[in-house]
């Protein structure tokens, strides 16, 4: 697995650098978890045609994944920071049974899926202290993602990997419209 | 990286339209956020417009409701529809490619640039 952010080896070549913003520290934790969903669709895309079937064929699924919207506050039309920022914390708090569910589907790139999900646990902890309003993040209830993490796991092998390629595709839009969304404030 | 050539500046009077081409070369293009940055004489680059991977759009305010960006993943083009025209729209436009697929309104966040093309506004 590649190493978090603030390890690699540019950083340690370099120990008179300014330290980093919370805002730059946000974004290069977002690029590192986006370029380990890029490693893990790899390995995906290599494994099932998954990749190749259209949006709308994919569309036509259960899973009830976060995805921004106008009322959110992320995009330039209506743009609002603090209900943009509650959106992407609580998007990515529903996000982590999704993350979960990815430990056990990948053979070659076994660390690199665990490195995404630690890696997301450490930027929502970042994102939390930027927040002011925590009290409008709602935490998803355990008992719910406990039993949807049992039922996707139950799936034959297809829906698997199908799961597996939607949640992948689905986070990777969701970081990046968040961090454009953060690129903003 | 991607290589970016731009293409379909020229001169236009003021209230006039144009419409700007970037094609990329060697790269996953649909996989970037692409954009548009412009540089009059005299001044700093700006930020114009941004489309992301999955086709989300931000545009600097002194061009909302004027410019349009869209992007044919097919053709590996990203377009700049420029209308109402004012000669402050005189510079030169550069295509920008960011292989997170985010983009942002700020240089550092793009690692591919074209060599631009002039835009000259007359009044």
């Known amino acids: 697995a590649p190493v978090p952010p603030g390890e690699d080896s540019k950083d340690v070549a370099a120990p008179h650098r300014q330290p980093l913003t919370s805002s730059e520290r946000i974004d290069k934790q977002i690029r590192y978890i986006l370029d380990g969903i890029s490693a893990l669709r790899k390995e995906t895309c290599n494994k099932s045609n998954m990749c190749e079937s259209s949006k709308e064929a994919l569309a036509e699924n259960n899973l009830n994944l976060p995805k921004m919207a106008e009322k959110d506050g992320c995009f330039q039309s209506g743009f609002n920071e603090e209900t943009c920022l509650v959106k992407i914390i609580t998007g990515l708090l529903e996000f982590e049974v999704y993350l979960e569910y990815l430990q056990n589907r990948f053979e070659s790139s076994e660390e690199q899926a665990r490195a995404v999900q630690m890696s997301t646990k450490v930027l929502i902890q970042f994102l939390q202290k930027k927040a002011k309003n925590l009290d409008a993040i709602t935490t998803p209830d355990p008992t719910t993602n406990a039993s949807l993490l049992t039922k996707l796991q139950a799936q034959n092998q297809w829906l698997q990997d199908m799961t597996t390629h939607l949640i992948l595709r689905s986070f990777k839009e969701f970081l990046q419209s968040s961090l454009r969304a953060l690129r903003q404030m | 990286q991607v290589q970016l050539q731009e293409s379909g500046g020229g001169l236009v009077q003021a209230g006039g339209s144009l419409r700007l081409s970037c094609t990329a070369s060697?790269?996953?293009?649909?996989?970037?956020?692409m954009a548009w940055f412009r540089q009059a004489p005299g001044k700093e680059r700006e930020f114009v417009t941004d489309i992301g991977e999955s086709g989300g759009t931000w545009y600097a305010d002194s061009v909302k409701g004027r410019f349009t960006i869209s992007r044919d993943n097919a053709k590996n083009t990203v377009y700049l529809q420029m209308n109402s025209l004012r000669p402050e729209d005189t510079a030169v436009y550069y295509c920008?490619?960011?292989?997170?697929?985010?983009?942002?309104?700020?240089?550092?966040?793009?690692?591919?640039w074209g060599q631009g093309t002039q835009v000259t506004v007359s009044s």
């Open positions: 060697g790269g996953t293009f649909s996989e970037y956020a």
């Open positions: 920008a490619a960011d292989s997170y697929g985010v983009g942002g309104g700020a240089e550092r966040y793009y690692d591919s």
